[in-house]
Each structure stands twice: as structure tokens, then as C-alpha cells.
Interface confidence: low
């Protein structure tokens, strides 16, 4: 399959060569998402002054973002590969609907926002192929996931700059967490 | 917007060589490929090569090994295509596709120019 | 080379009917489980335009009366219910190795 090369932009290995293994897939398309949103955070940045408001005044919102806790599995204590995978595959799935909303909050960076969600979608279907207990994966419903939306969308302007910098913020931590997760599957 | 803008219609004559150039605009990400592809009058489409956005990696179709170069200038965003010893048959249209160069992407090409007609005629 | 292959080559469906085009490749193009296998739409004196990507992921604005489906070497290509606006050539494309390669071709009419 075709496959991207090193980090080095002057390698010179064929783009369409060996597949690299599962794992390796996975850690540099999570690299690469990471690299999407700091792109955007630089936008949102550069747009308003939310990356210098404390964590504490951001902390108080009423989205449901998902983030790792103990339980999940993920973390060096109490790690259990399965359950944590699910949990990657599950919060990805609540993160669809919140990429959603970013994709017409950026101007210069348009492409960026599609990108981020376009290779989340296939990271998701990636990791679903490595998970054996499909069962325990819930899906999220697609009318609330519309309402949501909807709801998002109605906020004044504040309150969208604030809601696009949490999405990032949280998007951001949950992969960091998932990708240190899955180096130890 | 992400756009790829293809050189004009050229009238080639057998034997000779034709450059066809493609400007890309409207995105900023490194992680794309410019890919050529080719379709004769009433044909099917036919895949002739890829570069790098620097033209750091070129990948040619077997076919065309030898008679086609592919460049790319990332100080303009230009891609370029040059097929040499040209024939009646590469009367076509060719066309630049971009490819997204990443690991779990599918190297589907998603955005295309608008397409060069080529005619080789004596 | 994986040698693709289309059927019908033609196919002329009613308006608001459903419309079916398969593509077989020659030797599997999934990797990983992933299927590297395209679809594309053209239109008379138009570029190709990415309708799925990866057997079954619709491209950016595409309309969800468009679907795919398939793995290893057998692919399908269903427009739900035909609109005016979908006669065209469809092409299926495989990305699993160099060089690329597509199908020959489906002409989709109304009947």
C-alpha cells in the first residue's frame, strides 16, 4: 500500500512502497492529526485571546468532551489493553461531532480543519480493525449528535472561539493519551 | 479553495517533446502528492506518475518509463510533466490529480486540474 | 499490475431507481483489512471527481445517494436513487500498488 516517507522532507524512497506494520500505521497517522490541529490552534490563537485564559475559566462549560480517566485503561497503572482500546475507539466516535463544528470555523486554515476530520474518520475504521471486542463500542446517536450541533452553531461568537479552542485543546490531549496508550499494545 | 490550474492546449508534432505545468493553490499542508493522469480521446484514464510536492520522490508507470519526466518547483507550486518522443496515441488529455501523503489515506485523488489537451499530429 | 475490470460496461436506469456498477481487481488491493479501492464520477469535458475512497467513505460533498462496499477484490458502487445529474462515467481506481490503475469505464444513462 501506499506509504508516506520519513519525517525527513528530502527522502527519497518511493511514495508507493511496503506498508509499514499496524502499529507503526497508527502512531503516524495519530502524528499526523496532531499536526492538523496545532496547525489550526495557531489560527484560533492568532484569532482571540483564549489560548491565555487559565484552564480554571475554560474548565467551567458544558461540553461533554471526552477524556481518559483511571478507569479506561489507559494509563501506565492499571493498563488493560482492551478496555482501552475501546475507550480510544468509543471517545474518537464522540470526537466525529465536534470536528463537524470545526470545519467552517477556520479561514486560512480551511484545508487544515478536513484534514484533521477526514484522517480522524480513518483512524477510527483503522483502529476498529484492530479491535476485537467490537461489542463494547457505542455509537454515538446521530439525532443527538445533530442537536448538538445545532446548539453549537447558535452560540454567539465568544462562545464559539471558546467552544473551537476546547474541542482543539481536548482533541489534542485525548490523542496524546491514546497514542502513548497504543505504543504499548 | 483548492485549486490546480493546467497549462493550455498544445499541438504537438511526432517526435517531439510537450511540458505540461500545474500550479496548485489554496492549501498550505506538505502531506500531498501531485499525481499525472492521462485519458485518450473516448478512452478510459491511464496513470502515468507521482511527485512530491519538492520533487524530492518520483514514481513513474512502467509504460512511460523513459520518455516522461516529472518535476516539481515548491517555491512556485508548480508541478510539471514533460513526455518526449511523442506519438499519434499520446493524443489526450492530461490531467494532474492531488493525492493526500498520508500513512492511512488512501491516495485517492481528491482535487483535479481542469485538464491539457495534447494533440500529436504531423 | 492489477488489472481492473468493470461491469456493465453501460447502464441505462430509470430516474429514481437504483443503480449498481461493480469492479473486480484482478488480486486483492486490502491491506491491513483496508481496502485501497476508488470511485470516481465524469462528466463530458470534465476532470474525474472522488466519489468514495477506501470502498465505502464518501469524498467531500458528495450526496449519500452514492455508496460503496467491497473488500479484497470485489467492489460495488450503488447510487440509491438516480438523479439526472449522475449520468456520467464511473471509473473504479485501486491504490494498493503502483502503478495506480483503474477500471475501464461504466456509462451510467436514463433510461
Known amino acids: 500500500a501506499p506509504v508516506p516517507p520519513g519525517e525527513d522532507s528530502k527522502d527519497v524512497a518511493a511514495p508507493h512502497r511496503q506498508p509499514l506494520t499496524s502499529s507503526e500505521r497508527i502512531d503516524k497517522q495519530i502524528r499526523y492529526i496532531l499536526d492538523g490541529i496545532s496547525a489550526l490552534r495557531k489560527e484560533t490563537c492568532n484569532k482571540s485571546n483564549m489560548c491565555e485564559s487559565s484552564k480554571e475559566a475554560l474548565a467551567e462549560n458544558n461540553l461533554n468532551l471526552p477524556k481518559m480517566a483511571e478507569k479506561d485503561g489507559c494509563f501506565q497503572s492499571g493498563f488493560n489493553e482492551e478496555t482501552c482500546l475501546v475507550k480510544i475507539i468509543t471517545g474518537l466516535l464522540e470526537f466525529e461531532v465536534y470536528l463537524e463544528y470545526l470545519q467552517n470555523r477556520f479561514e486560512s486554515s480551511e484545508e487544515q480543519a478536513r484534514a484533521v476530520q477526514m484522517s480522524t474518520k480513518v483512524l477510527i475504521q483503522f483502529l476498529q480493525k484492530k479491535a476485537k471486542n467490537l461489542d463494547a463500542i457505542t455509537t454515538p446517536d446521530p439525532t443527538t449528535n445533530a442537536s448538538l450541533l445545532t446548539k453549537l452553531q447558535a452560540q454567539n461568537q465568544w462562545l464559539q472561539d471558546m467552544t473551537t479552542h476546547l474541542i482543539l485543546r481536548s482533541f489534542k490531549e485525548f490523542l496524546q493519551s491514546s497514542l502513548r496508550a497504543l505504543r504499548q499494545m | 479553495q483548492v485549486q490546480l490550474v493546467q497549462s493550455g492546449a498544445e499541438v504537438k508534432k511526432p517526435g517531439s517533446s510537450v511540458k505540461v505545468s500545474c500550479k496548485a493553490s489554496?492549501?498550505?499542508?506538505?502531506?500531498?502528492?501531485i499525481e499525472w493522469v492521462r485519458q485518450a480521446p473516448g478512452q478510459g484514464l491511464e496513470w502515468m506518475g507521482v511527485?512530491?510536492?519538492?520533487?524530492?520522490?518520483?514514481n513513474y508507470a512502467q509504460k512511460f518509463q523513459g520518455r516522461v519526466t516529472i518535476t516539481a518547483d515548491e517555491s512556485t507550486s508548480t508541478a510539471y510533466m514533460e513526455l518526449s518522443s511523442l506519438r499519434s496515441e499520446d493524443t489526450a488529455v492530461y490531467y494532474c490529480?492531488?493525492?493526500?501523503?498520508?500513512?492511512?489515506?488512501?491516495?485517492?485523488?481528491?482535487?483535479w486540474g481542469q485538464g491539457t489537451t495534447v494533440t500529436v499530429s504531423s | 499490475d492489477i488489472v481492473m475490470t468493470q461491469s456493465p460496461d453501460s447502464l441505462a436506469v430509470s430516474l429514481g431507481e437504483r443503480a449498481t456498477i461493480n469492479c473486480r481487481a484482478s488480486e486483492s488491493v486490502d491491506n491491513y483489512g483496508i481496502p485501497f479501492m476508488n470511485w470516481y464520477q465524469q462528466k463530458p469535458g470534465q476532470p474525474p471527481k472522488l466519489l468514495i475512497y477506501a470502498a465505502s467513505n464518501r469524498g467531500s460533498g458528495v450526496p449519500d445517494r452514492f455508496s460503496g462496499s467491497g473488500s479484497g477484490t470485489d467492489f460495488t458502487l450503488t447510487i440509491s436513487s438516480l438523479q439526472a445529474e449522475d449520468v456520467a462515467v464511473y471509473y473504479c481506481?485501486?491504490?494498493?500498488?503502483?502503478?495506480?490503475?483503474f477500471g475501464q469505464g461504466t456509462k451510467l444513462e436514463i433510461k
Open positions: 511527485t512530491t510536492p519538492g520533487g524530492g520522490t518520483i
Open positions: 490529480a492531488r493525492s493526500r501523503w498520508d500513512p492511512l489515506y488512501y491516495y485517492a485523488l481528491e482535487y
Open positions: 489554496g492549501y498550505v499542508l506538505p502531506n500531498y502528492l
Open positions: 481506481q485501486q491504490s494498493e500498488e503502483v502503478p495506480l490503475t
